[in-house]
Interface confidence: low
């Protein structure tokens, strides 16, 4: 069998809401994946599991099942949404994200995604990790790749 290539393209949109009483930020982050089937037979994308981390803490998880079938030598673009919550010990971020004196409230999030594909009863998992900028201060739609966090240095521990 030939390879199945998974490429994490980036954040497509981030929709934000706040709870002033709980000092909590809710971010619905939609991501885009390109999945390429290099085989001469169809492949089923069985599930996508994703999680988002902020400052080494998991703030959101999502799982999509029975997603699609990719034909021979074909590519499909798949969007998936991860609901995230920044709260409790990270509630200090609430003030940053709601400060009107700041125009762009970018935070760095680590996107992790695992794609499970099946063909002829065989299962294969491909994982990706990527750091992305997301604006926690307003609803934002991104040009694909625009939210890439290019700095090779990891966020401080």
């Amino acid at each position: 069998p030939r390879s199945i290539d998974v490429k994490y393209i980036g954040v497509k949109s981030a929709y934000v809401s706040y709870d002033v009483q709980k000092r909590t930020i809710y971010l619905n982050i939609t991501n885009t994946l390109n999945i390429t089937n290099n085989n001469y037979y169809s492949v089923e994308v069985e599930n996508i599991t994703a999680q988002v981390q902020f400052s080494k803490t998991v703030i959101g998880k999502a799982r999509l099942n029975n997603i699609t079938i990719i034909g021979p030598l074909d590519m499909k673009q798949i969007d998936y949404t991860v609901p995230t919550v920044i709260a409790e010990e990270m509630s200090y971020m609430y003030d940053f994200c709601t400060l009107i004196s700041i125009k762009v409230h970018n935070i760095v999030l680590m996107m992790q995604v695992t794609v499970t594909t099946t063909y002829f009863g065989h299962s294969e998992q491909i994982s990706q990790e990527r750091y992305q900028y997301v604006d926690c201060g307003r609803n934002t739609t991104y040009q694909l790749g625009q939210s890439e966090y290019l700095n090779v240095l990891q966020p401080q521990q």
Partner: antibody, heavy 123, light 112 residues
Framework: QVQLQQPGAELVKPGASVKLSCKAS????????MHWVRQRPGQGLEWIGN????????HYNHKFKDKATLIVDKSSSTAYLQLSSLTSEDSAVFYC????????????????WGQGTSVTVSS | DIVMTQATPSIPVTPGESVSISCRSS???????????LFWFLQRPGQSPQLLIY???NLASGVPDRFSGSGSGTAFTLRISRVEAEDVGVYYC?????????FGSGTKLEIK
């Protein structure tokens, strides 16, 4: 239309407890915080606390912490205020009022109020 | 706790006149997100309170535009232009920036 239905009156003996109800209709119960407010005869309004019906998250005025318990029953869209160890000082009208969801830009908060339940503590 | 002060217990007014009701808070109610978390309520005799103004200056649904709210972070004013007989009652300010939420003691509007 939005309605918050409260019983008109409750007569309770000193030392007893009472559970006041506030039945919500005309909106999605779990999308709106429910607040409780006390008004003693001839006095002003005092905020007792509130509860988020979606997850039962509560906040209390510390003044009422040992006196009041807020609970909800999602299946019947009803909020309850339980008052314990009642004395004549607890005689008052108790209002429930809903506010919009917690989003910081939430607009018309505490926009609907019940008619209030008059609690009289007397032997 | 944030203390809300309504220093004027009652205001007599003639129908058709304008009136201002004041309220002060012991701490600024201006949040970093730009909103000022102050309500104004009217409680007519024998009735439940009714929301008039939210976030200091926003008119609640169904409230006549004779009512308006203004203020800074700690000093607030409810203005009623052309007072009508139905405006009588007790006016309360309330902060909902911090728990516990707190009300002012109320200002009674009376017709002369």
């Amino acid at each position: 239309q939005v309605q918050l239905q409260q019983p008109g009156a409750e007569l309770v003996k000193p030392g007893a407890s009472v559970k006041l109800s506030c039945k919500a209709s005309g909106y999605t119960f779990t999308n709106h915080w429910m607040h409780w407010v006390r008004q003693r005869p001839g006095q002003g309004l005092e905020w007792i606390g509130n509860i988020d019906p979606s997850d039962s998250d509560t906040h209390y005025n510390h003044k009422f912490k040992d006196k009041a318990t807020l609970i909800v029953d999602k299946s019947s869209s009803t909020a309850y205020l339980q008052l314990s160890s009642l004395t004549s000082e607890d005689s008052a009208v108790f209002y429930c009022a809903r506010s919009r969801g917690g989003y910081y830009d939430y607009g018309e908060a505490m926009d609907y109020w019940g008619q209030g339940t008059s609690v009289t503590v007397s032997s | 706790d944030i203390v809300m002060t309504q220093a004027t217990p009652s205001i007599p007014v003639t129908p058709g006149e304008s009136v201002s009701i004041s309220c002060r808070s012991s701490k600024s109610l201006l949040h970093v997100n730009g909103n000022t978390y102050l309500f104004w309520f009217l409680q007519r005799p024998g009735q439940s309170p009714q929301l008039l103004i939210y976030r200091m200056s926003n008119l609640a649904s169904g409230v006549p535009d004779r009512f308006s709210g203004s203020g800074s972070g700690t000093a607030f004013t409810l203005r009623i232009s052309r007072v009508e007989a139905e405006d009588v009652g007790v006016y309360y300010c309330m902060q909902h920036l911090e728990y516990p939420f707190t009300f002012g003691s109320g200002t009674k509007l009376e017709i002369k």
